[in-house]
Structures are given as structure tokens and as C-alpha cells.
């Protein structure tokens, strides 16, 4: 479940998967940093399919994807990276 | 030994429907992503659609969505792709064939025999 | 959609030949392409994956280059197997093959 809209909840993840999910299916990704009155930081998976899912940040796919994307981000991504900047 | 054996290919009249089954063995089923790939007659290969392990998660191609649904019976081994409105140009071989596992691994590399679909008046 | 663009779309060689196939990408696929290796009347197997590991019992002559939107596969000395039809694959967004590339006997 998630909550995918600004809503009063302080977190927007309400439950985490870890299972992988290949790249060329997916659309982008939202990172949310810790802050804003939400203790821990959040992963926001776009699927190609239009459906949604928070991963577990700590699941080491996720962890190995963003880290191949941050060494490609100079060049252009299939897979657009978000980070919100929280005011 | 790992084989993908595909079943429930034939002729099929414009608007008709049909149920392709793969039946797997020799490796762990759920622990693959699973897709259908079509080749039309002495024609290139054509991706058609994808699932994930638990089948909780599905992808089309564009041309087939809302009319093709792909689903999985993890417990008794078999992929499926249920095929509505058929058109002439759905005519092909269907194969079923194996993605990454749920490590994202390309250790295997499995296809079926292929089924062929005839849309045909 | 990534559209992959494959050359040439027919080959005559001989035994011993060298041979390179082409694909080129719509846009950037990092080096997330596949090789396939077809024969009539039989399922696609594959040969190469992310664009220049072998596949475990594929031969050694076969290699895969490139990065970004180009890309070749090579094969060194052709045998008599090789004789076949030839597809890449882009899986960066979704799935793209290319049209094919049909190696024949010269």
C-alpha cells in the first residue's frame, strides 16, 4: 500500500517490498530522504505497467540499481531518479 | 533437464479466443520471471508480455494490451497467455521462455518448443 | 520506445570468415543487449547477455561489444553450425529485438 499523493500521513510508504524488480520495467524512481517528520528514508518505484510500490531501501537490488544509476548519472537514464528536496 | 513445453496453439477465427499453456520443468519455477515471445511466419521476434514471480505483476506490449492476459500457477508449473479479439496479425509461434531469476541473474537460458497461432478466417 | 535497428538483414560468408553484425539503439541502452542465435524450426538460444558475457557452452569464436547505442556481435572464424539467423536484443526499457540478421553460405 501506498500512499501516493501528499496526504497529512508523515511517511508515504506504508508497507516495503524487497522482491526485484528488473529495470527495463521500471519508469522511475522517488527517493524520499529521512525528515519531514518521517523517520526513516523512502524508495518510490514507477512501474511500467502504471502501478506503484515502496521497496525496502536496505534490499540489496535496490541498493546495487542505485548505485549503477549514480555511476551513470552523467549520461542520460532510462530510469529518471528523483530525490525530493524536503523544505 | 529443464524444458518448456508449450500446448493449446490452432486456427482461430478473427474475434476468437484462445488459451496458450507452458508447462515447465527441471528448475525452480517461482524463482523466474517469466515471458511470451512471438515470431510470426518467416518473420523477426516480437516480445508480447512478462510476469513476475508470484504473477502479482504483468507488462504488455502495446499492440496486445487488453487483450492478452498473461498468469502463472506457481504450484502446478505452468505459464499462460490468454488471448481475446485475436487479429490476423496475431498469427505466429508462441514461445514462453525464462527471464532473470529473483537475484536479477541471466544464468538460464530456457525456451519452449514454440505454439503455433493461426488467426484466419 | 526503443526502437533497434540491425545489419545488415543478410550475410553470404564462408567457412573461416570473420563476420560482424551491427545493431544500433534509438537511445542510450547503457550495455543492457542480448544476442540470440536462431535456426529454422527452433527456438531462439542465447549466445551473449549484457552486451559481452558468453553464454555458459556458447563457443568462444562468438563476442559481443559496444555501449550506449551501438553494438556488434563478432564472430571469428565462422564454422559450419553458424549458419543461422541472428537477433539482438535491447531489455533496457522494456523488451526491443532487432529484425534480424540471416548468415548464409556463400
Known amino acids: 500500500v501506498l500512499e501516493v499523493y501528499y496526504t497529512s500521513l508523515r511517511c508515504r510508504c506504508v508497507q516495503e517490498s524487497s522482491v526485484f524488480i528488473p529495470r527495463r520495467f521500471i519508469d522511475r524512481i522517488q527517493i524520499l530522504p529521512r525528515g519531514n517528520g518521517c523517520p526513516r528514508k523512502e524508495i518510490i518505484v514507477w512501474k511500467k505497467n502504471k502501478s506503484i510500490v515502496c521497496v525496502d531501501p536496505q534490499a540489496e537490488w535496490i541498493q546495487r540499481m542505485m548505485e549503477v544509476l549514480r555511476k551513470r548519472s552523467s549520461s542520460t537514464l532510462p530510469v529518471p531518479v528523483f530525490k525530493r528536496k524536503i523544505p | 533437464e529443464v524444458q518448456l513445453v508449450e500446448s493449446g496453439g490452432g486456427l482461430v477465427q478473427p474475434g476468437g479466443s484462445l488459451r496458450l499453456s507452458c508447462a515447465v520443468s527441471?528448475?525452480?519455477?517461482?524463482?523466474?520471471?517469466m515471458a511470451w515471445v512471438r515470431q510470426a511466419p518467416g518473420k523477426g521476434l516480437e516480445w508480447v508480455a512478462s510476469i513476475n514471480y508470484d504473477g502479482g505483476d504483468t507488462y504488455y506490449r502495446d499492440s496486445v494490451k487488453g487483450r492478452f492476459t498473461v498468469s502463472r500457477d506457481n504450484a502446478k508449473n505452468s505459464l499462460y497467455l490468454q488471448m481475446n479479439s485475436l487479429r490476423a496479425e496475431d498469427t505466429a509461434v508462441y514461445y514462453c521462455?525464462?527471464?532473470?531469476?529473483?537475484?536479477?541473474?541471466?544464468?538460464?537460458?530456457?525456451w519452449g518448443q514454440g505454439a503455433l497461432v493461426t488467426v484466419s478466417s | 520506445d526503443i526502437q533497434m535497428t540491425q545489419s545488415p538483414s543478410s550475410l553470404s560468408a564462408s567457412v573461416g570468415d570473420r563476420v560482424t553484425i551491427t545493431c544500433k539503439a534509438s537511445?542510450?541502452?547503457?550495455?543492457?543487449l542480448t544476442w540470440y542465435q536462431q535456426k529454422p524450426g527452433k527456438a531462439p538460444k542465447r549466445l551473449i547477455y549484457n552486451t559481452n558475457i558468453l553464454q555458459t557452452g556458447v563457443p568462444s569464436r562468438f563476442s559481443g561489444s559496444g555501449s550506449g547505442t551501438e553494438f556488434t556481435l563478432t564472430i571469428s572464424s565462422l564454422q559450419p553450425e553458424d549458419f543461422a539467423t541472428y537477433f539482438c536484443?535491447?531489455?533496457?526499457?522494456?523488451?526491443?529485438f532487432g529484425q534480424g540478421t540471416k548468415l548464409e553460405i556463400k
Open positions: 527441471g528448475f525452480t519455477f517461482s524463482d523466474y520471471y
Open positions: 536484443l535491447q531489455q533496457s526499457s522494456l523488451y526491443t
Open positions: 521462455a525464462t527471464e532473470e531469476d529473483y537475484d536479477g541473474s541471466y544464468v538460464m537460458d530456457a
Open positions: 537511445q542510450n541502452i547503457n550495455k543492457e
